[in-house]
């Protein structure tokens, strides 16, 4: 159930798909990967008020018990609904390696 | 990737199950639900430092990045990583039928 | 495993056009850092790059060639296809394309023959 | 474009022996670098990427050293499915270029 779709805090204030360019040395990856040098990573970031882009009937109770008791329970969070693959030209014990990675680059954001 | 399960904040501070009372009027079910009258909702509740209970390279990819930029790139976020299924007796047109949830309770935890 | 197919070679008239297309398995051109390139070979000579093609549409080409190349994807049928125009004798060649991840030019195809004559 | 220059064109060789090809760059290409075996009749396979690293599953008496526009292969001992024409390749800039080739043969 992914509900209403609208941003009640503005454009963009919302849970999104966002981009952040990360080199090798940011992501900490220098010591293992040889290529991208750089990635344009997609992740997941914005506030998740009362039911903007529901997960579930889970989310949906968090938002209900966050309003009850915003000290104990928190709102849901802005988290991948899925992932787009991407591969790595990884150094090996012998030499390189082209390895795909399924969870790494957020292919679409949901509350939860 | 389930990373260190040793929280550095203290005992009970990071990413756990937590179990919240909440009865029908807490989560605004009363007027579809007959019972339970009330539930034991298993969330997901906690802080996620640095590789705890890491879910996957994505959720290591966002400590990296909100070591770096704090105020661009949140922290990882402490979501279900399975949930326990329940069911609902629930009114209906004609009467009641028993209704199974597959992602009302959360199960275990991860950080995302 | 990853395998790669070339067809649409032949015999092919000067100052015609020819499009030939690689059908390939074991990977998804819509993962981040996956390309399909072209090469093709002159009858005993080396290598020669003409273009490729990334999994976000980006496309380069040969300097040389680059007025007569056209490369194209569709990632539902895992097909990437080059056309050359205005194809003269020097085109005559066996042309393979190749998996790329990044710069790197793993697994490639066992090639189709285009003959350019009248 | 990037000119990639090797040498020698051919050599005759025995199996057991130590093969060296170099390659040289028309400029700075950093360590982008690969090396390719083919085989007649065949497509190329790749052997070495970034100059001295070896992809997976190629036998370790082939290596790459080298960077900025010298490049070196070599083949430590040759095996009898070694004789080949081997190509450089610069992958630093397009358009990627190749060297003309160096065909390793039966002496």
């Known amino acids: 159930a992914r509900n209403g779709d609208h941003c009640p805090l503005g454009p963009g204030r919302c849970c999104r798909l966002h981009t952040v360019r990360a080199s090798l040395e940011d992501l900490g990856w220098a010591d293992w990967v040889l290529s991208p040098r750089e990635v344009q990573v997609t992740m997941c970031i914005g506030a998740c008020p009362s039911q903007f882009r529901a997960a579930n009937m889970h989310a949906q109770i968090k938002t209900s018990l966050h309003r009850l008791k915003p000290d104990t329970v928190p709102a849901p969070c802005c988290v991948p609904a899925s992932y787009n693959p991407m591969v790595l030209i990884q150094k090996t014990d012998t030499g390189v390696s082209l390895q795909t990675y399924d969870d790494l680059l957020a292919k679409d954001c949901h509350c939860i | 990737a389930r990373n260190g399960d040793h929280c550095p904040l203290g005992p009970g501070r990071c990413c756990r199950l937590h179990t919240v009372r909440a009865s029908l009027e807490d989560l605004g079910w009363a007027d579809w639900v007959l019972s339970p009258r009330e539930v034991q909702v298993t969330m997901c509740i906690g802080a996620c430092p640095s590789q705890f209970r890491a879910a996957n390279m994505h959720a290591q990819i966002k400590t990296s990045l909100h070591r770096l930029k704090p105020d661009t790139v949140p922290a990882p976020c402490c979501v279900p990583a399975s949930y326990n299924p329940m069911v609902l007796i629930q009114k209906t047109d004609t009467g009641v039928s028993l209704q199974t949830y597959d992602d009302l309770l959360a199960k275990d935890c991860h950080c995302i | 495993q990853v395998t790669l197919l070339e067809s649409g070679g032949g015999l092919v008239q000067p100052g015609g056009s020819l499009r030939l297309s690689c059908s390939f398995s074991g990977f998804s051109l819509s993962t981040y850092g996956i390309g399909v390139g072209w090469i093709r070979q002159a009858p005993g000579k080396g290598l020669e790059w003409l273009a490729h093609i990334w999994w976000n549409n980006n496309k380069y080409f040969n300097t040389a060639l680059k007025s007569r190349l056209t490369i194209s994807k569709d990632t539902s049928k895992n097909t990437v296809y080059l056309q050359m125009n205005s194809v003269r004798a020097e085109d005559t060649a066996v042309y393979y394309c190749?998996?790329?991840?990044?710069?790197?030019?793993?697994?490639w195809g066992q090639g189709t023959t285009v003959t350019v004559s009248s | 474009d990037i000119q990639m220059t090797q040498s020698p064109s051919s050599l005759s060789t025995s199996v057991g022996d130590r093969v060296t090809i170099t390659c040289k760059a028309s400029q700075d290409v950093n360590t982008a670098v690969a090396w390719y075996q083919q085989k007649p009749g065949k497509a190329p396979k790749f052997l070495i990427y970034?100059?001295?690293y070896r992809y997976t599953g190629v036998p370790d008496r082939f290596s790459g050293s080298g960077s900025g526009t010298d490049f070196t292969f070599t083949i430590s001992s040759l095996q009898p499915e070694d004789f080949a024409v081997y190509y450089c390749?610069?992958?630093?800039?397009?358009?990627?270029?190749f060297g003309q080739g160096t065909k390793v043969e039966i002496k």
């Open positions: 390749q610069q992958h630093y800039s397009t358009p990627w270029t």
């Open positions: 190749a998996r790329m991840g990044y710069d790197i030019m793993d697994y």
């Open positions: 970034s100059s001295s």
